[in-house]
């Protein structure tokens, strides 16, 4: 029963870890211009993996596909990579785990089937699930980068007087959702890792069983056999350490009822 | 099409306080934000802040800071502007205006002339 | 504030000849977002309302006559009037869109000789 839940649950974190991944890839907030000292901007910059935004207070957004591949830098392409990976290997993972359920019952299908396609299933959600957070914290890094480059000449004086401001850009909503979505999907994963190991019959004891010769009173007792499956009880359990990029908590200023410029 | 009507001529007396009137049509209210404009007789033209009906967030030049206050009632598709503690320098032609792309103002209000005197 | 400076302040002309109003603003109205400026150029003729002429710095508003070009980029706009007409006696003004609070320029009253 425990076995059932473990492996449900790890289907269903997994299915909504996800789900995550494909709305933080669909966003376009990934990077959104950072307010600093003006939390109200008549016109804002918001970028994601496949278009870049802005908002203006009049009430238009605008946004423009990139309609570049080779334009583009190759750590967005390399975040896009990470991202389609991440989701075409969790699809086939949830695909192959909804015939792994224990609860469903397709054909004569044996438990040590059922067991190995938990596990295969697993694997793919943590490698899914890390290929998100990998993808986001790539992200994440070139932001940071490009954040304090741009900081560095925020403003480049122009004749004195004039003075050119120049856009930074810091985490976009789509990049929190990516590593809540990447960590759901790789706790999915070992959810149905752990289930795997219920599902594996450990061994099947048959009973001794005696024969009485006409003569001699000779007990055959056939030794206990080991089911075969390739799952052990002597298995072992490998830790997976997430080498994500950790950031300090952004506070977003939003705009209140009434403010003065 | 789209309309801005405003409402009538006010007298006012210095000290006094005055509600203005923007009736919007012809477009989805909600969609667009409404910007007051404040032109004195012969001069130029000063923004006093804007309001935006779908969520009624509204920013003020601060040069306006307690002197104008904008609301707006998104049944009616009406904008309102409250001018407080009137003198006679904020005698002037009050217009709404409509946002539109690049943050310009495409559609203008007849505008409401506003007079303070004693 | 950014602070939108025209010149001339009154430019006085003959028919059909051509016109060349300036507009500086005290910072950048570039957004690099999407690579626009947020400079807006209005028409106002005596006792009427303003009218949206030329938005994003070059964009004419639908419905006005080709002889309005507007241009520049950064802190420097130009308006030009190819072939200027009798109709075109007016007051124009330039405002940032860029960044609040909406600021305007003082005007260029077109007159005629």
């Known amino acids: 029963m425990a076995v059932t839940a473990c492996q449900g649950l790890g289907f269903v974190v997994s299915l909504i870890g996800i789900a995550g991944i494909i709305a933080a890839t669909c966003m376009d907030q990934w990077s959104t211009q950072d307010l600093y000292n003006n939390p109200v901007t008549a016109v804002f910059n918001y970028q994601g993996l496949w278009r870049s935004c802005v908002r203006e207070s009049s009430g238009f957004t605008e946004c423009r596909g990139y309609f570049t591949l080779l334009g583009l830098p190759a750590m967005l392409q390399a975040v896009r990579a990470l991202m389609i990976v991440g989701i075409v290997l969790g699809a086939i993972g949830l695909l192959v785990s909804i015939f792994a359920l224990k609860c469903i019952r397709i054909g004569s299908m044996e438990d040590s089937a059922k067991a190995n396609m938990t596990l295969t299933s697993g694997i793919m959600f943590i490698v899914s699930g890390l290929c998100a957070i990998a993808g986001v914290s790539v992200f994440a890094n070139m932001l940071v980068t490009n954040f304090w480059m741009s900081t560095a000449n925020m403003y480049t004086g122009m004749g004195g007087m004039v003075q050119t401001v120049q856009t930074r850009y810091t985490f976009g909503a789509a990049l929190f959702v990516g590593w809540v979505a990447g960590g759901l999907t790789l706790i999915g994963g070992v959810m149905m890792c752990i289930a795997c190991r219920g599902l594996a019959p450990e061994e099947t004891n048959y009973k001794a069983v005696s024969y009485h010769a006409s003569g001699h009173s000779v007990a055959y007792k056939p030794g206990g056999f080991k089911a075969s499956t390739g799952f052990g009880s002597n298995t072992k359990n490998k830790k997976i350490y997430d080498g994500g990029a950790r950031t300090e908590d952004e506070v977003q200023s939003y705009p209140s009822k009434h403010d003065y410029v | 099409q789209v309309q801005l009507q405003q409402s009538g001529p006010e007298l006012v007396k210095p000290g006094a306080s005055v509600k203005l009137s923007c009736k919007a049509s012809?477009?989805?209210?909600?969609?667009?934000?409404i910007n007051w404009v404040k032109q004195r007789p012969g001069q130029g033209l000063q923004w006093i802040g804007r309001?935006?009906?779908?969520?009624?967030?509204?920013t003020y030049n601060e040069k306006f800071k307690g002197k104008a206050s904008l609301t707006v009632d998104t049944s009616s598709t009406t904008s309102y502007m409250d001018l407080h503690s009137l003198t006679s320098e904020d005698s002037a032609v009050y217009f709404c205006?409509?946002?539109?792309?690049?943050?310009?103002?495409?559609?203008w209000g007849q505008g409401t002339l506003v007079t303070v005197s004693a | 504030d950014i602070v939108m400076t025209q010149s001339p302040s009154s430019l006085t002309v003959t028919a059909r000849e051509k016109v060349i109003m300036n507009c500086k603003s005290s910072?950048?109205?570039?957004?690099?977002?999407?690579?626009?400026?947020?400079l807006t150029w209005y028409q106002q003729k005596p006792g009427q309302s303003p009218k949206l002429l030329i938005y994003?710095?070059?964009t004419r508003q639908s419905g006005v006559p080709d002889r309005f070009t507007g241009s520049g980029s950064g802190t420097d706009f130009t308006l030009t009037i190819s072939t200027v007409q009798a109709e075109d006696l007016a007051v124009y003004f330039c405002?940032?869109?860029?960044?609040?609070?909406?600021?305007f320029g003082g005007g260029t009253k077109l007159e005629m000789n």
């Open positions: 205006v409509r946002g539109n792309y690049g943050n310009s103002f495409a559609y």
């Open positions: 012809g477009y989805s209210f909600t969609n667009f934000d």
């Open positions: 994003w710095a070059s």
């Open positions: 910072q950048s109205l570039f957004n690099s977002g999407n690579q626009k400026n947020y």
């Open positions: 405002q940032n869109g860029f960044s609040f609070p909406y600021t």
């Open positions: 309001l935006y009906p779908r969520d009624g967030t509204t």
